[in-house]
């Protein structure tokens, strides 16, 4: 099974005719407390823009990016280096559609590290590419303090101690 070819989430060539390939994506909680249901049609439409990128075996493709889901567990910093060694980075989530894609492909309900940590230098939550988190889109549950790193669970972002060991997601 080459998941890199989009087998797990078939929206090839922007076509979503095979309805049996989809599960319900479910609700996503946004910062103001309102909910919006992300449909499979939304997910497919958002992917139709870029069908040319091919990911490696073991990597999933979505919206022109490649995603790798770990099976083992590491601290946030070890996960960060692991992705770096693969010339990728810990997951940066840009919007709810991407969060829905991630959640759809997480086969467990435990915490998963993402590329977001609290930097004491900036005193703010910062993605690994240096950009700040958009508080209008995402709310982080838990303390914003030194040695806090972000993990996702059931489409929500939580503040956790960076030395905790969780699974992680790399992206390029």
């Amino acid at each position: 099974l080459l998941v890199s070819q989009g087998v797990l989430l078939k929206c090839q060539k922007g076509s979503c005719s095979n309805a049996t390939q989809y599960e319900d994506t479910g609700d996503l909680k946004v910062n103001n407390g309102t909910r919006r249901n992300i449909s499979n049609k939304d997910l497919c439409a958002s992917r139709s823009a870029d069908q040319t990128v091919l990911c490696q075996s073991e990597w999933l493709k979505y919206q022109g990016k490649c995603y790798w889901f770990s099976n083992e567990m590491k601290s946030w910093s070890d996960s960060y280096v692991y992705c770096l060694e693969r010339k990728s980075h810990l997951l940066i989530i840009h919007d709810q559609l991407e969060m829905a894609f991630i959640q759809k492909n997480l086969r467990q309900l435990n915490y998963v590290w993402i590329g977001l940590n609290f930097t004491s230098l900036k005193m703010t939550w910062t993605w690994v590419d240096g950009s700040p988190i958009d508080s209008k889109i995402f709310f982080i549950k838990g303390p914003a303090k030194e040695n806090s790193c972000a993990a996702i669970k059931e489409s929500k972002i939580f503040s956790e101690t960076c030395s905790s060991v969780f699974k992680w997601i790399c992206q390029y």
């Epitope: 080459l2 890199s4 070819q5 990128v53 091919l54 990911c55 490696q56 075996s57 073991e58 990597w59 490649c66 790798w68 070890d78 280096v81 770096l84 060694e85 693969r86 010339k87 990728s88 390029y172």
Partner: antibody, heavy 117, light 110 residues
């Protein structure tokens, strides 16, 4: 630039350590230093790489695991330790650097050093 | 391990002609493929990376294409200086990382 040294004539079942020395840059950045070999008249064969970042992770071809060990010894040197050598290990050994950018490519190569078993 | 299979082993063409070298990966490697040129007694020289990006200073007569498992190096307007052995090299980046080479293609220019 890169330069390999330590190539020699060695007896079967013997051991040898090759050194790769960098000039013009140090291994303080995060990239891969790799070893590749080429038997006389044959093709290139990847041996393994070491990541020069804090983790110092090493990756080897399946056939090289156990007999070959790559180590970063100083800020400008990487070594390849080879044990239980056989005639099949006779080759020119190259060290190469995989650029630190987001792209995978060996953009700097040494001239090679000959190992004869 | 990922295996890179290169064809043909040898190809002959006239000056001004075109040669095509193919490289196949046993698993998808995305666009993580490089092409090298090697002449006798010299280390390999990088020509193309990320399947199709020309290394600085390499003439545009060299063109790389492909992604996933199928890749091609095309050399057009052949010159005598192009006589060499060409290697593809994939990079596999998942649980482990490997950089396997293809077996090489000798290009003879008549």
């Amino acid at each position: 630039s890169l330069e390999e040294s330590g190539g020699d004539l060695v007896q079967p079942e013997g051991s040898l350590t090759l050194t790769c020395t960098a000039s013009g840059f140090s291994f303080s950045g995060s990239y891969y230093m790799c070893w590749v070999r080429q038997a006389p008249g044959k093709g290139l064969e990847w041996i393994g790489c070491i990541y020069t970042g804090s983790s110092g992770s090493t990756y080897y071809a399946s056939w090289a695991k156990g007999r070959f060990t790559i180590t970063k010894t100083l800020s400008t040197t990487v070594t390849l330790q080879m044990t239980s050598l056989t005639a099949a290990d006779t080759a020119t050994y190259f060290c190469a650097r995989d650029t630190g950018s987001t792209y995978w490519r060996y953009n700097i190569w040494g001239p090679g050093t000959l190992v004869t078993v | 391990d990922v295996v890179m299979t290169q064809t043909p082993a040898s190809v002959e063409a006239a000056v001004g002609g075109t040669v095509t070298i193919k490289c196949q990966a046993s698993q998808s490697i995305g666009s993580d493929l490089a092409w090298y040129q090697q002449k006798p007694g010299q280390p390999p020289k990088l020509l193309i990376y990320t399947a199709s990006t020309l290394e600085s200073g390499v003439p545009s007569r060299f063109r790389g294409s492909g992604s996933g498992t199928e890749f091609t190096l095309t050399i057009s307007d052949l010159e005598c200086a192009d006589a060499a052995t060409y290697y593809c090299q994939g990079t596999y980046r998942s649980s482990s990382i490997s950089w396997p080479f293809g077996g090489g293609t000798e290009v003879v220019v008549k």
